[in-house]
Interface confidence: low
């Protein structure tokens, strides 16, 4: 009988949101404030994640689930579970070690994050440039020069390569 009892863990009856309190004869106690247990049978509650500084609370901590953070305006999440916040830049810029820098000629970034990417080289697909690229927008490719009616002109595509010394950091 005693052997059977020892195999049955009394803590297994404690639901999520509680912990098995060894100091109180293994009764199920509610998780203290600012802590949680997401599964039953826990012997401790985990401390809630604190969304401080550049982080802000996206989902409150409850007794059964951890808080979830996102980033304050002007920053965006990086990493699993928003483990880091990275500064936003403007469209047409990229973040370097020295801060936000404009995209080099021939590259663009249409988002507030990420790096500047080369404009599409329309000629590789046998097409012509219909709309010039900018720091914020890629070029728009049009029909191939052979498809154009006589007298129509196309914009000469610029070289898509980055300028030397302007690789993303």
């Amino acid at each position: 009988f005693e052997r059977t009892r020892s195999l049955q863990d009394p803590c297994s009856n404690c639901p999520a949101g509680t912990f098995c309190d060894n100091n109180r004869n293994q009764i199920c106690s509610p998780c203290p404030p600012n802590s949680f247990s997401s599964a039953g049978g826990q012997r401790t509650c985990d401390i809630c994640r604190q969304c401080k500084g550049v982080f802000r609370t996206r989902k409150e901590c409850s007794s059964t689930s951890n808080a979830e953070c996102d980033c304050t305006p002007g920053f965006h999440c990086l990493g699993a579970g928003c483990s880091m916040c990275e500064q936003d830049c403007k469209q047409g810029q990229e973040l370097t070690k020295k801060g936000c820098k404009d995209c080099c000629f021939g590259t663009f970034n249409d988002q507030k994050r990420g790096i500047c990417r080369p404009w599409t080289n329309c000629s590789l697909d046998g097409k012509s440039v219909l709309v010039n690229g900018t720091k914020e927008r890629d070029v728009v490719c049009g029909p191939s020069p052979a498809d154009l009616s006589p007298g129509a002109s196309s914009v000469t595509p610029p070289a898509p390569a980055r300028e030397p010394g302007h690789s993303p950091q």
Partner: nanobody
């Protein structure tokens, strides 16, 4: 916008009872712990009672244990404080407060709470 509005205060004789209510709006009431504090004339704000977000745990000041009961109705976004066996020393303005999601302070300190109501006056006199 977060709002807390207390009601139910008034004048009562010693030994009498009152039930205070705190109506919450503008946020997910059921996700937060709530508390009652009070402030007597010329004194600091004093912890009265606290209730966890899900009603799972309560805390009371020693001076009100056995006389006051804190409860909540998450469906109605309302916090309650049932006060009985009232004494003259219970005279104060009573405030409800929302517990911060995270705090390094003890749950009985005002710093643990981020939003407060305007208060309702409870007067106990013969």
């Amino acid at each position: 916008e977060v709002q807390l509005l207390e009601s139910g205060g008034g004048e009562v004789q010693p030994g009498g009872s009152l039930r205070l209510s705190c109506a919450a709006s503008g946020w997910a009431f059921g996700n937060y712990g709530m508390a009652w504090f009070r402030q007597a004339p010329g004194k600091g704000r004093e912890f009265v009672a606290r209730l966890a977000w899900n009603g799972g745990s309560t805390d009371y000041a020693e001076s009100v244990k056995g006389r006051f009961t804190i409860s909540r109705d998450n469906a109605k976004n309302t916090l309650y404080l049932q006060m009985s066996s009232l004494r003259a020393e219970d005279t104060a303005v009573y405030y409800c407060a929302r517990q911060r999601s995270y705090s390094r302070y003890d749950i009985r300190t005002p710093q643990t709470y981020d939003y407060w109501g305007q208060g309702t006056l409870v007067t106990v006199k013969p």
